[in-house]
């Protein structure tokens, strides 16, 4: 069977495949940055926010130098699936304060889904296993308060921003080795 409807065909050139994934990742990175800035303007953040259910940042000193393509793609796909779940949760449970950002969160979710489809295609082209997440999925309960949902949004967008930067750096670095 061909690629899912709405997904562009992937070429047989792995560099072109990676290019395409990098482009989508960079676009999503720009969207995330813009939305994070909007969040900061509307709801100023006091320091760093974290959320236990978010994936641990894939970056650590020395990681990028020793990356392999299967590891990067698998880790990225698993992490982005988690972020997708968190964005869906924000849209559903974020409450009235986040309703003003609904169009942007919807667009972000659509871009995330598109990137995930592209990564899935790339992984099947490279005959990589479609790995399931390592840890069990933590159910996301409703935020404790309006402020809780705002803090969660800051944490989700901040984490996604850094994850996407790691992804662009990793994918471009790997492309130089192909």
């Amino acid at each position: 069977p061909g690629p899912p409807a709405g997904s562009p065909r992937v070429s047989s050139d792995p560099r072109a495949d990676l290019d395409s994934a990098v482009l989508l990742t960079r676009s999503l990175l720009a969207d995330t940055r813009q939305l994070a800035a909007q969040m900061r303007d509307k709801f100023p953040a006091d320091g760093d926010h974290s959320l236990d259910s978010l994936p641990t940042l894939a970056m650590s000193a020395g990681t990028l130098g020793s990356l392999q393509l299967p590891g990067v793609l698998t880790r990225l796909r698993v992490d982005l699936m988690s972020y997708l779940r968190h964005v869906q949760w924000l849209r559903r449970a974020g409450g009235p304060s986040l309703k003003t950002l609904e169009p942007e969160l919807g667009a972000l979710q659509a871009r995330l889904e598109r990137l995930l489809r592209r990564l899935q295609l790339l992984m099947s082209r490279l005959a990589l296993p479609q790995a399931a997440p390592d840890q069990p999925v933590i159910p996301l309960g409703p935020p404790a308060s309006a402020w809780g949902s705002i803090r969660a949004a800051h944490a989700i967008l901040g984490g996604l921003h850094l994850t996407l930067d790691w992804a662009v750096r990793g994918l471009l670095l790997l492309k130089t080795r192909l």
Epitope: L64, L162, D165
Partner: antibody, heavy 119, light 111 residues
Framework: EVQLVQSGAEVKKPGASVKISCKAS????????MDWVKQAPGQRLEWIGD????????IYNQKFTGRATLTVDKSASTAYMELSSLRSEDTAVYYC????????????WGQGTTVTVSS | DIVLTQSPASLALSPGERATLSCRAS??????????IHWYQQKPGQAPRLLIY???NLDSGVPARFSGSGSGTDFTLTISSLEEEDFATYYC?????????FGQGTKLEIK
């Protein structure tokens, strides 16, 4: 005001190492990558590498891999570049620059640190 | 690595004139509507200053007389009406792939 302030000029002997600092202020340090660029006399600007202050490992231009080491002290909003096994062609001005995540354009630059390698 | 070639190497013009600086890449630096080319201005003894990012976006605080255009391998920086403070060296830079590289520069001098 967004600023990057670099350490002062250095004169080194061939074979030695040099470590340059770059202190960031006026913005959230972890929101941007920190990049390093070399400008040797009469040569084009050369990207050395960058580091994500949030905790990402550095990435390097292959030309500098093994000799350049990029680090950050997040608590002090300071980035460092160490260059080892210095030779005369390392004589240059070295700049730190704030890099947009994922896009590698540099919207804020340090004032530059002149490194002279001479016996 | 992608090689960027700037032309002319130097250009002598008078204040008020229009300046057109060119940057050519050894392979395309554009993809699906994004062009990963950026322009900087550098004056003697100073650090470079970002003028234009992603081919055509003016950085904050940069006068509107500066504009960038182009796609694929050919890019242009235009200064519509030169002011005294515009005489400097201009560099293009790409970020399509790693490593990012710079052009050799175009020196803009007062005629």
């Amino acid at each position: 005001e967004v600023q990057l302030v670099q350490s002062g000029a250095e004169v080194k002997k061939p074979g030695a190492s040099v470590k340059i600092s770059c202190k960031a202020s006026g913005y959230t340090f972890t929101d941007y990558n920190m990049d390093w660029v070399k400008q040797a006399p009469g040569q084009r600007l050369e990207w050395i590498g960058d580091i994500n202050p949030h905790g990402g490992g550095p990435i390097y231009n292959q030309k500098f891999t093994g000799r350049a080491t990029l680090t950050v002290d997040k608590s002090a909003s300071t980035a460092y570049m160490e260059l080892s096994s210095l030779r005369s062609e390392d004589t240059a001005v070295y700049y730190c620059a704030r890099g947009e995540l994922g896009h590698w354009y540099f919207d804020v630059w340090g004032q530059g640190t002149t490194v002279t390698v001479s016996s | 690595d992608i090689v960027l070639t700037q032309s002319p190497a130097s250009l002598a013009l008078s204040p008020g004139e229009r300046a057109t600086l060119s940057c050519r890449a050894s392979k395309s630096v554009s993809t699906s509507g994004y062009s990963y080319i950026h322009w900087y201005q550098q004056k003697p003894g100073q650090a470079p200053r970002l003028l234009i990012y992603l081919a055509s976006n003016l950085d904050s605080g940069v006068p509107a007389r500066f504009s960038g255009s182009g796609s694929g391998t050919d890019f242009t920086l235009t200064i519509s009406s030169l002011e005294e403070e515009d005489f400097a060296t201009y560099y293009c830079q790409h970020s399509r792939d790693l490593p990012p590289t710079f052009g050799q520069g175009t020196k803009l001098e007062i005629k």
